[in-house]
Interface confidence: medium
């Protein structure tokens, strides 16, 4: 999403339809406090960012409140009065849903139903990954509500689970980000465990697809 203009790379993340984060990497201006100017409507005057992100003492991004907005973000990154990067983006295409909350497990013999609080907006996939120490890689199952039943489990084995939320690509496009994973929880015989013996450390999720 960040083609270079005058050596400026940008990244946009719309956190849970609540906060937009725009960050930039400008090698040419690495020791410069670039300013961020924005508007949500093509007719308005630009506002200047009031919540900058800093890296090594210099501005590197901006956080904007943008609660449940389907808006175009018009923005300009400037060195003094000189614009070094100007663009506009439909924010929703850079959605990153929040991590699943209130994750619960309901066991019935060789199956478990994983539930969590559905987010307030739709067109999402709720993905559960799970593995036992005997599995070489994570298994995955996803549904469009946070109610995912996994069958065919061995009650004697210990399983690690974690959950995340993804935006549906055919609705939001390919430039979204999956949520962070929920905490790993381990279960055996329908009871929670501190850990599953010999389970390798789960791979860190990639930020983007």
């Amino acid at each position: 999403q960040g083609g270079a203009a005058e050596g400026v790379q940008i990244q946009i993340i719309y956190f849970n339809l609540e906060t937009v984060q725009v960050t930039w990497n400008a090698s040419k201006y690495s020791r410069t406090n670039l300013t961020f100017h924005y508007r949500f409507n093509g007719d308005e005057a630009y506002d200047q960012c009031t919540n900058y992100l800093l890296q090594e003492g210099h501005t590197s991004g901006c956080l904007l409140d943008a609660e449940q907005r389907d808006d175009i973000l018009y923005f300009s990154i400037r060195n003094g009065t000189h614009p070094v990067f100007t663009a506009s983006r439909w924010m929703v295409y850079y959605l990153k849903p929040s991590s699943p909350k209130h994750v619960r497990f309901s066991w019935h013999q060789d199956a478990v139903t994983v539930t969590c609080s559905d987010l307030s907006y739709g067109d999402l996939l709720y993905e559960v990954q799970y593995r036992s120490p005997f599995d070489t890689e994570w298994q995955s199952k996803q549904e469009n509500t946070c109610n995912v039943t996994i069958e065919g489990l061995d009650a004697e084995k210990c399983y690690s689970f974690w959950v995340r939320v993804k935006a549906m690509e055919d609705v939001y496009g390919p430039d979204t980000y999956p949520s962070d994973w929920s905490e790993v929880t381990c279960w055996q015989r329908g009871e929670i465990r501190d850990a599953c013996a010999e389970t390798p450390t789960p791979p860190k999720p990639k930020l983007s697809k």
Epitope: R89, D123, Y172
Partner: antibody
Framework: QVQLVQSGAEVRKPGSSVKVSCKAS????????ISWVRQAPGQGLEWMGG????????KYAQKFQGRVTITADKSTSTAYMELSSLRSEDTAVYYC?????????????WGQGTLVTVSS | DIQMTQSPSTLSASVGDRVTITCRAS??????LAWYQQKPGKAPKLLIY???SLESGVPSRFSGSGSGTEFTLTISSLQPDDFATYYC?????????FGQGTKVDIK
């Protein structure tokens, strides 16, 4: 395979309005944005505006602001473009197009076009 | 709005020729540029997006290059099916804007 099928040709008098529809099959209108692009006879392409049906709000090119209304009905997978206060310069082929894969700004599927003729 | 200027407006060429069309943006658009092909009475067809990425199903004789304000569409060996009008389009900043078109006709 996504297909966008538009309503038929229209003839209107100056000052009136026209509403063109665009029905998606093999996919839904909620897939990416749906935009409307027009082309006057022998002229180039002009983006009028677009809508993200998951939210139902539209964005318009400055030139058409106040005269064009773009809507979408998720239940029927249909998008609509209404242009009011028509004048002879609005005679054109109107295309609906689905936003493409790159930042939703390119158009990878197009309707067949609807000719709107404005004449007294 | 960002202005897109294509050159030439008309280009006469023969089958097998290497053809290059240029598109200039009035300000930097990074790589947010697409190219379309349009034949008379038909809707445009997406060829290239993000300046140089080939759309699925488009023949490899089409290629795009450039970034910032200068872009080119190249047809390495013109085929009979390629005689058409070509448009560039920026999608860096709303409103999306198109070039005025380049008509490629038979010499």
């Amino acid at each position: 395979q996504v297909q966008l099928v538009q309503s038929g040709a229209e003839v209107r008098k100056p000052g009136s309005s026209v509403k063109v529809s665009c029905k998606a099959s093999g996919g839904t209108v909620s897939s990416y944005a749906i935009s409307w692009v027009r082309q006057a006879p022998g002229q180039g392409l002009e983006w009028m505006g677009g809508i993200t049906p998951i939210f139902g709000t539209a964005k318009y090119a400055q030139k058409f602001q106040g005269r064009v209304t773009i809507t979408a009905d998720k239940s029927t997978s249909t998008a609509y473009m209404e242009l009011s206060s028509l004048r002879s310069e609005d005679t054109a082929v109107y295309y609906c197009a689905r936003g493409g894969i790159a930042a939703a700004g390119t158009f990878d599927y197009w309707g067949q076009g609807t000719l709107v003729t404005v004449s007294s | 709005d960002i202005q897109m200027t294509q050159s030439p407006s008309t280009l006469s060429a023969s089958v097998g020729d290497r053809v290059t069309i240029t598109c200039r943006a009035s300000q930097s658009i990074s790589s947010w540029l697409a190219w379309y092909q349009q034949k008379p009475g038909k809707a445009p067809k997406l060829l290239i997006y993000k300046a140089s990425s080939l759309e699925s199903g488009v023949p490899s004789r089409f290629s795009g290059s450039g970034s910032g304000t200068e872009f080119t569409l190249t047809i390495s060996s013109l085929q009979p099916d390629d005689f058409a009008t070509y448009y560039c389009q920026q999608y860096n900043s709303y409103s999306w804007t198109f070039g005025q078109g380049t008509k490629v006709d038979i010499k």
